[in-house]
Interface confidence: medium
């Protein structure tokens, strides 16, 4: 099926940028792995590179505004022609759910005291308003609550005194039209406007002040343009060469608004001065290699020794990684394929252990399934031997850091009937549904 092809994929927002055009196949669009595509306008944007997980979205708001609730976040498998880790198809969402608490307590209403005395009238002549107030302290609200209703009320009051009314101008009327729309006629064009002292008129008893200034004004019509000439398009120019050497590009034709040129404020030519076409080199673009994540460290050994486990004898171990995805003469991966370090082997060594503090509460699992729970643990943590943290392997080569490697067998006193892990579980509350943000409402 044809897709909309774009020249850029914005990792931070997951949006397609730089529309190249529509009506091309995914395979043609993805000849260049820097490109991206959409199956329909406004739909999900997928980059042409090999699939990998997007960044996690921000956590959604807590499902309740007070007390304990739950909140979700997601990430999406984005890319083309492959799968993300976990053997997951592009377009798939992975969710995480965690407990949350915006505010520990829920608001409680308060009650009003009695009304206070009326304040004086707001004006000294004619009619105004007066106000009285009451306090929200009978009892006071708790946890950000409030009292129902208003803290003050007002009523009309009459001073029995007549106020004077001062005159004020109404808005200016419109300028009379100029006698000509283009300059160069026999008479100098003029325009006039007037206003009335009626907003309001000054009172007689008690006497109000009259309006200041003049009731009309006149001015010359300046800056009238010469009569306009509308612009017209010249012919289309030649098609520009295809600007890319691989994948899809965009060629362009141009024309100029000079047949005739617009004059004296005449309208510019309607329509576009350029038009574009997609050009297809049918050549795949180079794809640079990307390092896979490092493999596991090899066992910690020392040449000519059967085992160095549980001994203060430094050994060596290595790990490797693979350069994947390099195609069509792209760049090789930069950096080393193998990593070597010095190590002490504590594989299967019986070590004295101590119980850790409680871990923080984990995520709610399953985030999109029924009855999610969260857990925390205390672990029997081994006390590592006090071997030297650095060694000097060859004279003059300086000190090298030495890392402990292997899974020891820690020994702790029993805790709640357990020797290695004590776990506490708790259900997650007010769990929201996992709603696909890209899915339209059905």
């Amino acid at each position: 099926d044809p897709v909309l092809c774009f020249t850029q994929y914005e990792e931070s927002s997951g949006k397609c940028k730089g529309l190249l055009g529509g009506g091309v196949s995914v395979e043609d669009c993805c000849l260049n792995t820097a490109f991206a595509y959409q199956k329909r306008s406004g739909g999900l944007c997928q980059p042409c590179r090999s699939p990998r997980w997007s960044l996690w979205s921000t956590w959604a708001p807590c499902s309740v505004t007070c007390s304990e609730g739950s909140q979700l976040r997601y990430r999406r498998c984005v890319g083309w022609n492959g799968q993300c880790s976990g053997k997951v198809a592009p377009g798939t969402l992975e969710w995480q759910l965690q407990a949350c608490e915006d505010q520990q307590c829920c608001p409680e209403m308060g009650g009003w005291s009695g009304w206070g005395p009326w304040e004086p009238c707001s004006v000294t002549c004619s009619k105004g308003t007066r106000t009285r107030r009451r306090a929200c302290n009978h009892p006071a609200p708790k946890c950000g609550g409030h009292c129902p209703g208003q803290a003050q009320e007002s009523e009309a009051c009459d001073t029995q005194q007549v106020c004077p009314t001062h005159g004020a101008w109404a808005t200016w009327g419109p300028w009379t039209p100029c006698s000509a729309s283009c300059h160069g006629g026999p008479h100098e064009p003029k325009e006039t406007r007037s206003r009335k002292c009626s907003a309001p008129e000054p009172s007689q008893k008690p006497p109000g002040k009259p309006c200041p200034g003049l009731a009309y004004e006149q001015r010359r019509c300046t800056g009238l343009p010469p009569c306009p000439v509308a612009g017209g398009w010249g012919p289309w120019g030649p098609v520009s060469p295809c600007p890319v050497t691989c994948g899809l590009g965009q060629t362009m034709e141009q024309r100029t608004c000079n047949h005739p040129v617009p004059q004296h404020g005449g309208p510019f030519c309607a329509g576009d001065a350029t038009r574009t076409h997609i050009c297809n080199t049918a050549v795949p673009c180079p794809v640079d290699g990307e390092w896979d994540s490092w493999g596991e460290w090899s066992p910690c050994i020392r040449r000519n020794m059967k085992s160095i486990s549980c001994q203060e004898i430094p050994g060596q171990q290595s790990r490797g990684r693979t350069c994947r995805g390099r195609k069509f003469d792209g760049h090789r991966c930069a950096g080393q394929q193998q990593d070597i370090r010095h190590c002490y082997s504590i594989q299967h060594c019986p070590l004295k252990g101590s119980w850790s503090e409680w871990s923080t509460w984990g995520l709610c699992m399953p985030p999109c399934g029924p009855n999610p729970t969260r857990a925390r643990q205390r672990l029997c943590t081994p006390l590592l031997p006090k071997y030297p943290p650095t060694v000097s392997m060859v004279e003059g080569q300086g000190e090298k850091n030495v890392t402990f490697w292997g899974r020891p067998l820690p020994r702790c006193e029993e805790l709640q009937g357990q020797k290695l892990v004590v776990e506490e579980k708790r259900p997650c509350l007010h769990v929201p549904a996992c709603k696909d943000p890209e899915e339209e409402e059905l």
Epitope: R76, C77, V88, A89, P90, G91, T92, L93, E94, W95, M365, P366, P367, C368, G369, P370, A433, C434, K435, D436, E438, E439, L442
Partner: nanobody, 129 residues
Framework: QVQVVESGGGLVQPGGSLSLSCAAS????????MGWFRQAPGKEREFVAA????????YYADSVKGRFTLSRDNAENTVWLQLNSLKPEDTAVYYC??????????????????????WGQGTLVTVSG
Amino acid sequence: QVQVVESGGGLVQPGGSLSLSCAASGRTFSSYAMGWFRQAPGKEREFVAAITWDGANIYYADSVKGRFTLSRDNAENTVWLQLNSLKPEDTAVYYCAAAESGRYSGRDYYSAPGVYLYWGQGTLVTVSG
């Protein structure tokens, strides 16, 4: 373990309607997402529709959107697929399947047959004048 049994298939004229049901045994039915797939003679198995464990998300293939409706009742351990405005190209064996709900969601995930753990034997729908 979940056993899945489809029913409701049959012969119907173009433009007609049919209701397929999928009954599942086992107390854990409500923790599974349920999907429908179809397979026409000589063709690959094709995704039709899917519904998450809580019914919060329903996904349809573009070819059936607006004509087919998927729903579920966790109390009755049943999923229904209502087929309206049927066309001859809808002729196929329709299969119901159950997938575990957990970390993942989205049309692309639930349209992949590989994520479904339990499948029914299928029910035949024939659309013919």
